[in-house]
């Protein structure tokens, strides 16, 4: 039985040309993590792997960087980064969980962090 | 240099049981996935069988469900897969892969074959 | 089990030539499409991975572009080497499946 949340930074905002960190936290489970798998809609953009470490896919490698931890960190960010991003946990054995985020990248200088939230 | 190198391939009859290996070289093996890929002769790529590094959780094709069984012996860097009740449509090259972060096989063996006839 | 369906399933092109292969999923698989080019007798060779990532050592007249359910597998110019077939391949979910392939043939 899957038992785990996933807790993410939920909905978060940033100013055009920042940076901003997307996090995932997976409690209440003891299963091992194996691998986190970062998407953003259609598109992979990483994958930290518990024994190969970190894989960023080639066409985001100037704008991503892995970190801190399992999270991810976007930079010189665009307007066309707005959108879901999805932190999905292979584990063993429960199997996987998927975490979801909302980034919205303002061109303003107002942009504040929403709430966290679970996803069970 | 990876170096996977497939053996145990031949001729079997129908019904009958063959255990095909595929030997690990120049890389971590026991970091990654693996799988099998057939290809019966003039057709396409079928994927077989394949097992996680971590959990060792196996996956199968449903033509070979309940009749292969994929293995690894990671002392060994050793990859197996296990054929009972072979049948005439198993008749194919057998290829074993190297499956990293599970997204894609970017290592391939030179395959063996095996011709499953009475 | 996700279906790959490949097109055309053979083609006649000349040296030079830019080539287009298209592949559509089923259901959606993200990006989790991979492109491989085999040629008579020989195993696969991994090109393109994850819709749009280059394999290292594989010339970059290769590319690889879609996301969802549509893929496309583009040869900028056709070199002599690259008369093959070429497959896609779905990673999204387990039974991982192949398209029918490509035969790529000289004109």
């Known amino acids: 039985m899957m038992t785990g949340t996933i807790e993410t930074t939920g909905n978060i905002s940033a100013e055009k040309g920042g940076s901003i960190i997307l996090q995932c936290h997976l409690s209440s489970t003891t299963a091992q993590v194996t691998q986190v798998n970062w998407e953003q809609q259609d598109q992979l953009l990483a994958i930290c792997n518990a024994d190969l470490g970190w894989h960023i896919s080639p066409s985001f490698k100037d704008r991503v960087a892995p970190g801190p931890g399992l999270g991810l960190t976007l930079q010189s960010l665009t307007v066309n980064d707005t959108g879901e991003y999805f932190c999905i946990y292979h584990t063993y054995p429960d199997g996987t969980y998927t975490g979801r985020i909302f980034l919205e990248v303002l061109e303003s200088s107002v942009a504040e962090h929403g709430a966290r939230f679970q996803i069970p | 240099e990876v170096q996977l190198l497939e053996s145990g391939g031949g001729l079997v009859q129908p019904g009958g049981s063959l255990r095909l290996s595929c030997a690990a070289s120049?890389?971590?093996?026991?970091?990654?996935?693996m799988n099998w890929v057939r290809q019966a002769p003039g057709k396409g790529l079928e994927w077989v069988a394949g097992?996680?590094?971590?959990?060792?959780?196996?996956y199968y094709a449903d033509s070979v469900k309940g009749r292969f069984t994929i293995s690894r012996d990671n002392s060994k860097n050793t990859l197996y897969l296990q054929m009972n009740s072979l049948r005439a449509e198993d008749t194919a090259v057998y290829y074993c892969?190297?499956?990293?972060?599970?997204?894609?096989?970017?290592?391939w063996g030179q395959g063996t074959l095996v011709t499953v006839s009475s | 089990d996700i279906q790959m369906t490949q097109s055309p399933s053979s083609l006649s092109a000349s040296v030079g030539d830019r080539v287009t292969i298209t592949c559509r999923a089923s259901?959606?698989?993200?990006?989790?499409l991979n492109w491989y080019q085999q040629k008579p007798g020989k195993a696969p060779k991994l090109l393109i991975y994850a819709a749009s990532s280059l394999q290292s050592g594989v010339p970059s007249r290769f590319s690889g572009s879609g996301s969802g359910t549509d893929f496309t597998l583009t040869i900028s110019s056709l070199q002599p080497e690259d008369f093959a077939t070429y497959y896609c391949?779905?990673?999204?979910?387990?039974?991982?499946?192949f398209g029918g392939g490509t035969k790529v043939e000289i004109k």
């Open positions: 120049g890389f971590t093996f026991s970091s990654y996935s």
């Open positions: 892969a190297r499956g990293p972060y599970d997204v894609w096989m970017d290592y």
């Open positions: 391949q779905q990673s999204y979910s387990t039974p991982l499946t």
């Open positions: 097992i996680k590094y971590s959990s060792g959780n196996k």
């Open positions: 259901q959606s698989i993200s990006s989790y």
